[in-house]
Interface confidence: low
C-alpha cells in the first residue's frame, strides 16, 4: 500500500493582521495511526503551534472534528494574526509509539506572511520658516507595515514631486517595516494655501492609500514690500503720510514710524485685508504737523514682520514747499494707485 | 472587468501557439489568472493557471497539456500569456481566459484557479489542422 | 474527478438542485448557455454570487457534495452547469457538465 504522505497545499498564505490565518494540511491515509502536530519552523529549536494529541492552544482551532475516524483534514485556523506570527509552518504526522509517539512525516511547510497595515503618514516641516525661492525639507514616516513593498509619492497641491529620498527599514527580513522619506521643496510666493501631501500605497490598503499633509503656511514667510506715500490734507499746516505693507505672511507685523529717526508710533497689524493668495496687506497712516518742523522732515516707515530684521522705506518731507503742491506732486509719482486716500 | 484574449486561429500540428489575455479593471497582480479550453461539443477543460501572492508566482497545468505549456504573466502590462507546443489536433476549441476571485484581500491567497473563477473572457477558438 | 448528473428537468417555477461531489474543499459553478460561448459564474468558493447574479442562484457544500440550487427556475435558465473544484495539486478539474431543460 502506498506510504502516507502529509500534504500541505499552499506554498504561501498572506493573511492581513488581526484576521484569522488559515493552515491546510491534509495526509493520504489513515495509517499508521498517530496525532498530528503543528510546529512554526524547523529542527530542535520549532516552536509547537497544536498538538492534536494534549495541550491548550486558545489561538487555534480545526478546520474539521479530528475526533472523526476517518478525518485526514489537519488544517488549522490561527486567529488574531499579528507579524510576530509570520514565519513557515510545518505539518507532522506521528506515528503511535512506546513510550513516546515518533515523528513520521512532515508536510513541506507554508509559508505565513502577516500583512499588517501601514500607519498613517506623518509630515513634518522644517523648525523655522523660509522665504520664497528657498528650498525646504518635509519629512514622512510610516510605520509598522508588512510586506516590506511599498510605494510612497509627494504632490504639492497635486502635482507630483520628483526630488526626495525614501528609505525602508530594517534593510533584511523583519516582522514589520518602516519607511522615512525627505522631499525637497522649492517655496514660492503664492504657496500661503499650498499643501504637501505624503501618500503611501500598500497591499493592505487595497487601494487607497494613506496621506499625510502639511500646510505651507506653516512653513512659508512671504516679506512685506513698502511704500510710502504722502497726501494732502484740508489743514494748510498739516500732510497725510500713508505706508502701505503688502502681500506679506504670516500677519505677526509691527510697524514703527520714524520722524528723522525719533519713534513717533509704534502699532501692531490688526485690521488686515487678506489677498486671494493668502497673503495680508496692511496700511498705517501719519498726520504730520508741518509748522513744527523748520527744516525739512524724513519719515520711515520701518517694519518687523515675524521676527525679521525691520526692514524701512522712507519718505523726505519738505516744508518749505506748500502741502497741497507737495501732495499733487506725490499723487503724480503714484498715478494708478489703488489705494483709498485716508484724512 | 474585462479580459480580452487574443492569438487564435488555424494552427498546424506540431506547431506553436501564443495566447494572450490583456486584463482590465482590477488589480491584477492580486489576482490568479487561469486558461480553460472547450473542444467542439465538448465540456469545460482546465489548461493552465498562474497564481500570485506575496510577489510569487506559480502554475499548474491540466494533464492534457502538462509538458507542452507554459503560462506566465507581465503584471506591468496586466497580461497572461499561454504558449502551447506540439500541438495536436485535440488542442483545438475555444481557449477563455479566466480570473479567480483569490487574491491578496483580508483573505488568504488561495491558489486556486477552476473552484473561483469569478469572471471570463469571450474566448479565442483556436482551430489545429493540416 | 468530479461527478455531477448529466442532465436534470424542472417545471417553470420550481426549485431545482445540482450535485457535483469530490474530494474538494471549495467548487465553482459556471453556466453556459451556448456551446463555445463564454461561461457565466454563479457561484465561487462554494457559496459566494458575484453581486449580478440573481439571488435565485445559491451554492452549498455539505461533506464532499456541493449543490447548486436555482429557486423558481425560469425558462432562460435553459443551459448547461459546470462545477469546478481543484486537485491536491492544484490542477483545475470540472464536471463534464449537467443539461436543465425547463418544462
Known amino acids: 500500500e502506498e506510504e502516507l504522505q502529509v500534504i500541505q497545499p499552499d506554498k504561501s498564505v498572506l493573511v492581513a493582521a488581526g484576521e484569522t490565518a488559515t493552515l491546510r494540511c491534509t495526509a493520504t491515509s489513515l495509517i499508521p495511526v498517530g496525532p498530528i502536530q503543528w510546529f512554526r519552523g524547523a529542527g530542535p529549536g520549532r516552536e509547537l503551534i497544536y498538538n492534536q494529541k494534549e495541550g491548550h492552544f486558545p489561538r487555534v482551532t480545526t478546520v474539521s472534528d479530528l475526533t472523526k475516524r476517518n478525518n485526514m483534514d489537519f488544517s488549522i485556523r490561527i486567529g488574531n494574526i499579528t507579524p510576530a506570527d509570520a514565519g513557515t509552518y510545518y505539518c507532522v504526522k506521528f506515528r503511535k509509539g512506546s513510550p513516546d509517539d515518533v515523528e513520521f512525516k512532515s508536510g513541506a511547510g507554508t509559508e505565513l506572511s502577516v500583512r499588517a497595515k501601514p500607519s498613517a503618514p506623518v509630515v513634518s516641516g522644517p523648525a523655522a520658516r523660509a522665504t520664497p525661492q528657498h528650498t525646504v525639507s518635509f519629512t514622512c514616516e510610516s510605520h509598522g507595515f508588512s510586506p516590506r513593498d511599498i510605494t510612497l509619492k509627494w504632490f504639492k497641491n497635486g502635482n507630483e514631486l520628483s526630488d526626495f529620498q525614501t528609505n525602508v527599514d530594517p534593510v533584511g527580513e523583519s516582522v514589520s517595516y518602516s519607511i522615512h522619506s525627505t522631499a525637497k521643496v522649492v517655496l514660492t510666493r503664492e504657496d500661503v494655501h499650498s499643501q504637501v501631501i505624503c501618500e503611501v500605497a500598500h497591499v493592505t490598503l487595497q487601494g487607497d492609500p494613506l496621506r499625510g499633509t502639511a500646510n505651507l503656511s506653516e512653513t512659508i514667510r512671504v516679506p512685506p514690500t513698502l511704500e510710502v506715500t504722502q497726501q494732502p490734507v484740508r489743514a494748510e499746516n498739516q500732510v497725510n503720510v500713508t505706508c502701505q505693507v503688502r502681500k506679506f505672511y504670516p500677519q505677526r507685523l509691527q510697524l514703527t514710524w520714524l520722524e528723522n529717526g525719533n519713534v513717533s508710533r509704534t502699532e501692531t497689524a490688526s485690521t488686515v485685508t487678506e489677498n486671494k493668495d493668502g497673503t495680508y496687506n496692511w496700511m498705517s497712516w501719519l498726520l504730520v504737523n508741518v509748522s513744527a518742523h523748520r527744516d525739512d522732515v524724513k519719515l520711515t516707515c520701518q517694519v518687523e514682520h515675524d521676527g525679521q530684521p525691520a526692514v524701512s522705506k522712507s519718505h523726505d518731507l519738505k516744508v518749505s514747499a506748500h502741502p497741497k503742491e507737495q501732495g499733487s506732486n506725490t499723487a503724480a509719482e503714484n498715478t494708478g494707485s489703488n489705494e483709498r486716500n485716508i484724512y | 472587468v474585462t479580459l480580452d484574449e487574443s492569438g487564435g486561429g488555424l494552427q498546424t500540428p506540431g506547431g506553436a501557439l501564443s495566447l494572450v489575455c490583456k486584463a482590465s479593471g482590477f488589480t491584477f497582480n492580486s489576482y490568479n489568472m487561469g486558461w480553460v479550453r472547450q473542444a467542439p461539443g465538448k465540456g469545460l477543460e482546465f489548461v493552465a493557471g498562474i497564481y500570485s501572492a506575496g510577489g510569487d508566482t506559480s502554475t499548474t497545468y491540466g494533464a492534457a497539456v502538462n509538458g507542452r505549456a507554459t503560462i506566465s504573466r507581465d503584471n506591468g502590462q496586466s497580461t497572461v500569456r499561454l504558449q502551447l507546443n506540439n500541438l495536436r489536433a485535440e488542442d483545438t476549441g475555444i481557449y477563455f481566459c479566466?480570473?479567480?476571485?483569490?487574491?491578496?484581500?483580508?483573505?488568504?491567497?488561495?491558489?486556486?484557479?477552476?473552484?473561483?473563477?469569478?469572471?471570463w473572457g469571450h474566448g479565442t477558438e483556436v482551430i489545429v489542422s493540416s | 474527478a468530479v461527478t455531477q448528473p448529466a442532465s436534470v428537468s424542472a417545471n417553470l417555477g420550481e426549485t431545482v438542485k445540482i450535485t457535483c461531489s469530490g474530494d474538494?474543499?471549495?467548487y465553482g459553478w459556471y453556466q453556459q448557455k451556448a456551446p463555445g460561448s463564454a461561461p457565466v459564474t454563479l457561484i465561487?468558493?462554494?457559496?459566494k454570487r458575484p453581486s449580478n447574479i440573481p439571488s435565485r442562484f445559491s451554492g452549498s457544500k455539505s461533506g464532499s457534495t456541493a449543490t447548486l440550487t436555482i429557486t423558481g427556475v425560469q425558462a432562460d435558465d435553459e443551459a448547461v452547469y459546470y462545477c469546478g473544484n481543484e486537485d491536491m495539486n492544484y490542477v483545475g478539474i470540472f464536471g463534464a457538465g449537467t443539461t436543465l431543460t425547463v418544462l
Open positions: 474538494s474543499s471549495y
Open positions: 479566466a480570473k479567480a476571485a483569490g487574491g491578496c484581500t483580508a483573505h488568504n491567497c488561495d491558489a486556486y484557479i477552476a473552484d473561483s473563477i469569478d469572471a
Open positions: 465561487y468558493d462554494n457559496d
